[in-house]
């Protein structure tokens, strides 16, 4: 019986050009995590395998950094990065748990630009 639950950061927003940490946490189970897949819709970003380490999809290798932990850091964000991200936890003996994160990448705010160039 699968007793675990995935906790995620839920809906998050970040600024264009910045970075964000995608983080999931599996709780309420003693199952062993054997692999975590990070996916955006049907596109693989990375796999973290307990035995082997990380496989970063070549399409993302310049913008994705492993960690912290089983999480994933997405860098140099663009508006096209807006969307759903999934952490898929493969566990033994429970099976597969999936968590969802929605990321919205925002244009730099006018207020922030205004603050930077404020006349004293």
């Amino acid at each position: 019986m699968m007793t675990g639950t995935i906790e995620t950061t839920g809906n998050i927003s970040a600024e264009k050009g910045g970075s964000i940490i995608l983080q999931c946490h599996l709780s309420s189970t003693t199952a062993q995590v054997t692999q975590v897949n990070w996916e955006q819709q049907d596109q693989l970003l990375a796999i973290c395998n307990a035995d082997l380490g990380w496989h970063i999809s070549p399409s993302f290798k310049d913008r994705v950094a492993p960690g912290p932990g089983l999480g994933l850091t997405l860098q140099s964000l663009t508006v096209n990065d807006t969307g759903e991200y999934f952490c898929i936890y493969h566990t033994y003996p429970d099976g597969t748990y999936t968590g969802r994160i929605f990321l919205e990448v925002l244009e730099s705010s006018v207020a922030e630009h205004g603050a930077r160039f404020q006349i004293p």
Partner: antibody
């Protein structure tokens, strides 16, 4: 020398579930540096990768089939299995299992070629 | 996904002739390109891994070259037993993909 052998029903009815097993002999399925694949080939057509499983249960499936595919592993029997549900005539094919090797180092890993293949088993979807 | 485009689809060749089969990837795959030979009613047999490394037992007339997106399998001095379909395969990126195949027929 490692050998792979596919087994399962040769005929499956539309809308039912196709179930195949690949038995590994001459080596352990639990080796850290291998991943275990299913590939299919419709009559007169090319090869289509279905997905893989690692001995500890980690999988990745072809997005084109993901909603219908489950690959599982039984290390005690040195076997891994494929289930494909809601089959149609388009799933008629020769199904192969194959061993892929993995390169790892420095905290990263990479997928290598598939160096050992089963002989294949023909599955026909028909009522 | 990475699309592998093979050409030609079909080639009819006389014995002892040289055969060149090309495989083009839709994006760079480095050197993660492999070749397989499949004869009728048989499973694919590994020929060459990582562009140019021959598997043991593969005749020296088979060779591979290329990098990035463009790759070539060459059969020098074709023999009758080489009649088969040849597939390229990339392991750089998931999902793993295969080329559409090139059928080589002996004239």
């Amino acid at each position: 020398q490692v050998q792979l052998q596919e087994s399962g029903p040769g005929l499956v009815k539309p809308s039912e579930t196709l179930s195949l097993t690949c038995t590994v002999s001459g080596g352990s399925i639990s080796s850290v540096y291998f991943y275990w694949n299913w590939i299919r080939q419709p009559p007169g057509k090319g090869l289509e990768w279905i997905g893989y499983i690692y001995y500890s249960g980690g999988t990745y499936y072809n997005p084109s089939l993901r909603s219908r595919v489950t690959i599982s592993v039984d290390t005690s029997k040195n076997q891994f299995s494929l289930k494909l549900n809601s089959v149609t005539a388009a799933d008629t094919a020769v199904y192969y299992c194959a061993r892929g090797s993995i390169a790892a180092g420095g905290g990263y890993f990479y997928y290598n070629d598939m160096d050992v293949w089963g002989q294949g088993t023909t599955v026909t979807v028909s009522s | 996904e990475i699309v592998l485009t093979q050409s030609p689809d079909f080639q009819s060749v006389t014995p002892k002739e040289k055969v060149a089969i090309t495989c083009r990837a839709s994006q760079s795959i480095g050197s993660s390109l492999h070749w397989y030979q499949q004869k009728p009613d048989q499973s694919p047999k590994p020929l060459i891994k990582y562009v140019s490394q021959s598997f043991s037992g593969v005749p020296s007339r088979f060779s591979g070259s290329g990098s990035g997106t463009d790759f070539t399998l060459t059969i020098n001095s074709l023999e009758a037993e080489d009649a088969a379909t040849y597939y390229c395969h990339q392991s750089s990126s998931l999902p793993l993909t295969f080329g559409g195949g090139t059928k080589v027929e002996i004239k």
